[in-house]
């Protein structure tokens, strides 16, 4: 949903403070182009290119990354990259990942505290409930689509020949063996971290020890902290802490402003990182292709499985989600998607929803007119619990493995796969390759062999990227839908439901006709005096 930019009397778009403090004036045509409008004349083409420069650079980076990767791996000889050379080759990409991960912690915590504190409890509850309902429904739809596609295309039967090359002894050792109950208990434990500081870099996980108890070997569950941010725990804490701050009333306002300011500063850093994203993405994609030993052979053996996953992701991402968005908002979903191309490409490059979060926040706010307190409340939750891509892939993989090992799937098993995939995808929590771990839970739930998880792992580098793109797209469209819901409830009620706690100094408000902008965006007279500055907008990169 593209919010009309606030205009001055001359019909120009509002001047916006840039990251370096200057003002950027963008014409209405530029805004239209940026929002996915069509470019006609040469002048318009130039404007269009300028407005969409970052998007174009990102798309070019992905294509260039694929070309570079294929070129390097195809060249061989002097260009052949050993492990030590490969790590140097992907270094620019590693740098992007590090920058994004550096931003995640302050961004998630501050944005959620600020977001939860800026909404009145009733609105917060409603918003959260609608968000979770949207996430649940779309994940279930993705699961159903995955099962349906796999049953129709039969990727397992087509790929049965890979069994022969893999050999009878699969690699069950590679398959994580974890009780379904323990997986969900771990999820609950991570929601309530015992130590907030360690939650920033560690999560709780159950492993097993074999102990001799009265002459019998018994598998005993043992809890331990494992590397990896407990984003779920941080999200829950931040929301609860934000609600608590709001309860404090005036006493909590200073702290709310602190978190909002921290958030703004973080978003300025994000706007700088965004310009480095195309470089990083190019090397991440290229590096992954170089790393693969025989991509051609892999596609020949697992082509139908890959096709099934990617086709499912494409159908869900380009048809199902946009259709849901259109039905509820009556707005062009593809225009919305155009506004988030950069984070989608970043999701493809980094393969992590968490790492994409900073860019996604920036883009939905600046390109798609989603209010800050909505995007910064919904997106971190979405990045944690909304895993349409993962659920779809897990369902395809489960059916694929059933077909591969000639195991039947009755109605009860199919329902079990759908429910388990939907539930366990929540636990994947934005960690790269988390989906393969939860796949083992699904296979165990329907008594399917775990031997073939090694095959799934072989192409996970590609499928997981596609999953991540779909996951983050679902988050963004969810934020867009909720923005629309808020807009409608706002226009119906006289008293605004959502109260934004401002981090700026109070300035005299400049009245703006509601139809010209987003009713949630509050406008203030800019420092220049004549131009209006939308306080909800951050910087133009």
């Amino acid at each position: 949903m593209v919010a009309d930019p606030p205009r001055d009397s001359k019909g120009l778009a509002a001047a916006e403070p840039t990251a370096n403090g200057g003002l950027a004036l963008a014409s209405i045509e530029d805004q239209g182009a940026a929002a996915g409008g069509y470019c006609g004349s040469r002048d318009q083409v130039r404007r269009c290119l300028r407005a969409n420069l970052l998007v174009l650079l990102t798309v070019v980076a992905v294509v260039a990354g694929v070309a570079l990767g294929l070129g390097v791996s195809g060249a061989g000889g002097a260009l052949a990259l050993g492990p030590e050379r490969l790590s140097a080759f992907v270094f620019p990409g590693e740098l992007l990942l590090r920058l994004l991960r550096m931003i995640i912690l302050p961004l998630v915590v501050c944005s959620l505290i600020g977001g939860a504190a800026s909404l009145d409890p009733g609105a917060l509850g409603r918003l959260g409930a609608w968000a979770l309902l949207f996430f649940l429904v779309t994940t279930l739809l993705a699961s159903a689509l995955g099962v349906g596609l796999a049953l129709a295309l039969q990727p397992g039967a087509a790929s049965a020949a890979i069994n022969a090359s893999v050999g009878a002894a699969g690699s069950a050792e590679n398959a994580p063996s974890k009780e379904v109950l323990d997986s969900f208990l771990d999820l609950a434990r991570n929601i309530f971290p015992s130590n907030l500081v360690s939650a920033a870099f560690r999560s709780y996980s159950t492993t097993y020890e074999e102990r001799n108890i009265t002459g019998t070997r018994v598998k005993v569950p043992v809890g331990q902290e494992v590397e990896g941010m407990n984003i779920l725990g941080l999200v829950v804490f931040a929301i609860v802490f934000g609600v608590a701050l709001r309860k404090l009333g005036p006493e909590g306002e200073l702290l709310i402003r602190f978190f909002n300011s921290f958030n703004e500063a973080t978003m300025v850093l994000v706007s700088w990182i965004m310009w480095y994203a195309p470089v990083g993405i190019m090397f991440l994609v290229a590096g992954k292709i170089v790393e693969m030993e025989d991509v051609g052979l892999l596609f020949a053996r697992l082509g139908k499985y890959i096709l099934c996953c990617l086709l499912g992701h494409a159908i869900h991402g380009l048809l199902v989600l946009p259709l849901i968005y259109f039905l509820f908002t009556r707005k062009n979903p593809y225009r919305f998607l155009w506004g988030i191309v950069t984070p989608l490409a970043t999701a493809f490059g980094t393969s992590s929803s968490s790492a994409t979060l900073p860019l996604m926040m920036k883009c939905v706010e600046e390109n798609n007119g989603v209010a800050k307190h909505i995007s910064r409340f919904i997106l971190p939750i979405g990045a944690t619990v909304n895993m349409d891509g993962a659920a779809l892939f897990q369902c395809v993989a489960a059916v694929f493995i059933a077909q591969l090992s000639q195991q039947s799937l009755d109605f009860v098993k199919i329902i079990t796969i759908l429910v388990t995939a939907t539930a366990s995808s929540v636990g994947a929590a934005g960690i790269p390759a988390g989906g393969v771990l939860t796949l083992a839970i699904i296979l165990e739930a329907v008594n399917l062999p775990v031997d073939h998880i090694s095959l799934i792992l072989a192409v996970d580098w590609l499928v997981d990227r596609s999953c991540t793109v779909l996951n983050v797209e679902g988050d963004a469209l969810g934020a867009g839908l909720l923005q629309n819901y808020v807009d409608r409830t706002e226009s119906r009620s006289t008293e605004p439901e959502l109260i934004q706690v401002k981090s700026e100094l109070p300035l005299d408000p400049l009245p703006v006709p509601t139809e010209e902008g987003n009713p949630l965006l509050k406008h203030y007279r800019g420092p220049a005096g004549d131009a209006t500055v939308a306080s909800e907008k951050e910087s133009v990169m």
Partner: antibody, heavy 120, light 107 residues
Framework: QVQLVQSGSELKKPGAPVKVSCKAS????????MSWVRQAPGQGLKWMGW????????IYGDDFKGRFVFSLDTSVSTAYLQISSLKAEDTAVYFC?????????????WGQGTTVTVSS | DIQMTQSPSSLSASLGDRVTITCRAS??????LNWYQQKPGKAPKLLIY???RLHSGVPSRFSGSGSGTDYTLTISSLQPEDFATYFC?????????FGQGTKLEIK
């Protein structure tokens, strides 16, 4: 009812080939995988591998790669085990067994067995 | 490969006796344990699959239990037709492996 009927006993010389058949009836042949199990004299049971009856793809156990070939003729619902260049240690009873389509790897119906004796 | 160890290797019992045969896996097989009965010169017959589920047509005097690595087959009251060799088999991962067998004889 489900039935697996195997071909009769074989007496072969070392180096010769042998082909054992297993005709299935009483169920949809291409729905269940077909496994082959060997039982050497006085020994236990050893899984040789299985064939994906829908895709027609064989999967061999580590000790049965090379001289052993699993094949199918779906038009007559029959699975075959062919052993080339027979050795004395191939003397055993060979069973075909239908692989269950549930609970991973177990065998719910077995053929009566085909005794292959390799002797010069 | 997962090793399956059956005990005892042979067992003498009388009609009406309650008999227990145990099977131990070299690693956790998560209940994917199956039991077969084989009579001399015949093919094995499935008795129990997935630790405790009775195959169709198998008398209810046969029962199975266990978890993790340790499993048991129990015959509550021996009948004349029960004297045979019993094999356990793990179906958790490829390749499926069998125990060496327990020969049940008349005392």
């Amino acid at each position: 009812q489900v039935q697996l009927v195997q071909s009769g006993s074989e007496l072969k010389k070392p180096g010769a080939p042998v082909k054992v058949s297993c005709k299935a009836s009483g169920y949809t042949f291409s729905t269940f995988g077909m496994s082959w199990v060997r039982q050497a004299p006085g020994q236990g049971l050893k899984w040789m591998g299985w064939i994906h009856t829908y895709a027609g793809v064989p999967i061999y156990g580590d000790d049965f790669k090379g001289r052993f070939v699993f094949s199918l003729d779906t038009s007559v619902s029959t699975a075959y085990l062919q052993i080339s260049s027979l050795k004395a240690e191939d003397t055993a009873v060979y069973f075909c067994a239908r692989r269950s389509d549930n609970y991973r790897y177990f065998f719910d119906y077995w053929g009566q067995g085909t005794t292959v004796t390799v002797s010069s | 490969d997962i090793q399956m160890t059956q005990s005892p290797s042979s067992l003498s019992a009388s009609l009406g006796d309650r008999v227990t045969i145990t099977c131990r896996a070299s690693q956790d097989i998560r209940n994917y344990l199956n039991w077969y009965q084989q009579k001399p010169g015949k093919a094995p017959k499935l008795l129990i699959y997935y630790t405790s589920r009775l195959h169709s047509g198998v008398p209810s005097r046969f029962s199975g239990s266990g978890s993790g690595t340790d499993y048991t087959l129990t015959i509550s009251s021996l009948q004349p037709e029960d004297f045979a060799t019993y094999f356990c088999q793990q179906g958790h991962t490829l390749p499926p492996t069998f125990g060496q067998g327990t020969k049940l004889e008349i005392k």
